[in-house]
Amino acid sequence: TPEVWVQVQMEATELSSFTVHCGFLGPGSISLVTVSWGGPDGAGGTKLAVLHPELGTRQWAPARQARWETQSSISLALEDSGASSPFANTTFCCKFASFPEGSWESCGSLPPSSDPGLSAPPTPVPILRAD
C-alpha cells in the first residue's frame, strides 16, 4: 500500500523558519503534490503550495520556496513573520496524486517539545483517499 510521510522541522539558525518535507512511498508516477496547513486539502486546510513535476510550482504566503527533492519527495520552506510562532502548533498535510494508485495524504506537525533543528519522525498519519 502506498504511504505518504511528513516531517516538519524548525531551522536551528532561524527560529522563525520552518521546513516541511513530504515523500511518497509507492509505485506509480506522481502527477501532483498539494501542501496545506490547518488540515487536509479541501477539508478545512489552506493551500500553501502545489507542485507539478514538469509544469512547475505555485505557492502562497507564508510559503517561501517549494521544490522537488527527489522524484517522489518535496520540501516547502516557510517564513513565520509573527513573533508567537504559530507554526509550532500547526498541522501540515501533503497530498500526492499518483496514477493509478490515486490520491494519498498524510499530515504532521512539529513535535511539541522539539528543539531547533529536531525533526518529527517520518511516521505517516495516512488519510487514505484513493480517489
Epitope: S31, H52, L55
Partner: antibody, heavy 122, light 107 residues
Framework: QVQLVQSGAEVKKPGASVKVSCKAS????????ISWVRQAPGQGLEWVGW????????KYSQELQGRVTMTTDTSTSTAYMELRSLRSEDTAVYYC???????????????WGQGTLVTVSS | EIVLTQSPATLSLSPGERATLSCRAS??????LAWYQQKPGQAPRLLIY???NRATGIPARFSGSGSGTDFTLTISSLEPEDFAVYYC?????????FGGGTKVEIK
C-alpha cells in the same frame, strides 16, 4: 517528442453528433490534462473545455455545457471530445492541447494537436 | 467571465522593427496569462506563460510582462517568420478565455 495527433475532418448534418479523438505520445499522459479549443472560420480561439487525464474530472464552457462530453482512455493515451445536437455555428476547427492535471493551476496549452475541421451543413 | 481585450487589432510593421502588443483583462488575473502565436493553416503555439516565462524553444526576442489587468508581449526585432496572429489567454478564472487576437502584418 511530445505530440498530439487528432482524427480526420468530419462533415455532419444539424442535430447529429461528432466525436473527435486526440492521441498523445512522448509524455506521461496521466500527469497532464487535455483542453479543447475551437476556431470558427476566420475567427478567434474559443475554449471548449478541459479534462484531467489523471482523474477524469472535467470543466466545460457554459455555452456548450450539456452538449459536450470529454473522456480519456489512459490505456491508449487518447482523449475524446463528443459534441451533440450539432448546429451550423459549431462549424470550426477543433484543437486539443496538453494542459494541467488540475484546472486551477498551470493551465496553459502546449503543445496543440493539428486540428480537426468539423463542418455542420444540411 | 473575464474578457480579454487585445490592441491593436492589426499592427503593420517592417522586419527588424519592435512590436508591442497589449492585452487588457476585465479584472485581475494576477500573473496568470499566456501568449500564443498562430500562422495561417496552423495550430497555435505557446510563446509565454505566467506573463513572462518563455516556453521551451521560443527565441529570446519574445518577451512578456505585466500583472493584474495589463499585459504586454514584445517582439524586440521582427523576423519574417514572426508575422502572424497573436492571442492572449488568462489562466486564472473559470472559464479560461482568450483575447480576440492581434494580427502582425508586413508593412
Amino acid at each position: 517528442q511530445v505530440q498530439l495527433v487528432q482524427s480526420g475532418a468530419e462533415v455532419k448534418k444539424p442535430g447529429a453528433s461528432v466525436k473527435v479523438s486526440c492521441k498523445a505520445s512522448g509524455y506521461t499522459f496521466t500527469s497532464y490534462g487535455i483542453s479543447w479549443v475551437r476556431q470558427a472560420p476566420g475567427q478567434g480561439l474559443e475554449w471548449v473545455g478541459w479534462i484531467s487525464s489523471y482523474d477524469a474530472s472535467t470543466k466545460y464552457s457554459q455555452e456548450l455545457q450539456g452538449r459536450v462530453t470529454m473522456t480519456t482512455d489512459t490505456s491508449t493515451s487518447t482523449a475524446y471530445m463528443e459534441l451533440r445536437s450539432l448546429r451550423s455555428e459549431d462549424t470550426a476547427v477543433y484543437y486539443c492541447a496538453r494542459g494541467s492535471p488540475i484546472y486551477e493551476h498551470f493551465n496553459w496549452f502546449d503543445p496543440w494537436g493539428q486540428g480537426t475541421l468539423v463542418t455542420v451543413s444540411s | 467571465e473575464i474578457v480579454l481585450t487585445q490592441s491593436p487589432a492589426t499592427l503593420s510593421l517592417s522586419p527588424g522593427e519592435r512590436a508591442t502588443l497589449s492585452c487588457r483583462a476585465s479584472q485581475s488575473v494576477s500573473s496568470y496569462l499566456a501568449w500564443y502565436q498562430q500562422k495561417p493553416g496552423q495550430a497555435p503555439r505557446l510563446l509565454i506563460y505566467d506573463s513572462s516565462n518563455r516556453a521551451t524553444g521560443i527565441p529570446a526576442r519574445f518577451s512578456g510582462s505585466g500583472s493584474g489587468t495589463d499585459f504586454t508581449l514584445t517582439i524586440s526585432s521582427l523576423e519574417p517568420e514572426d508575422f502572424a496572429v497573436y492571442y492572449c489567454q488568462q489562466l486564472s478564472h473559470h472559464p479560461l478565455t482568450f483575447g480576440g487576437g492581434t494580427k502582425v502584418e508586413i508593412k
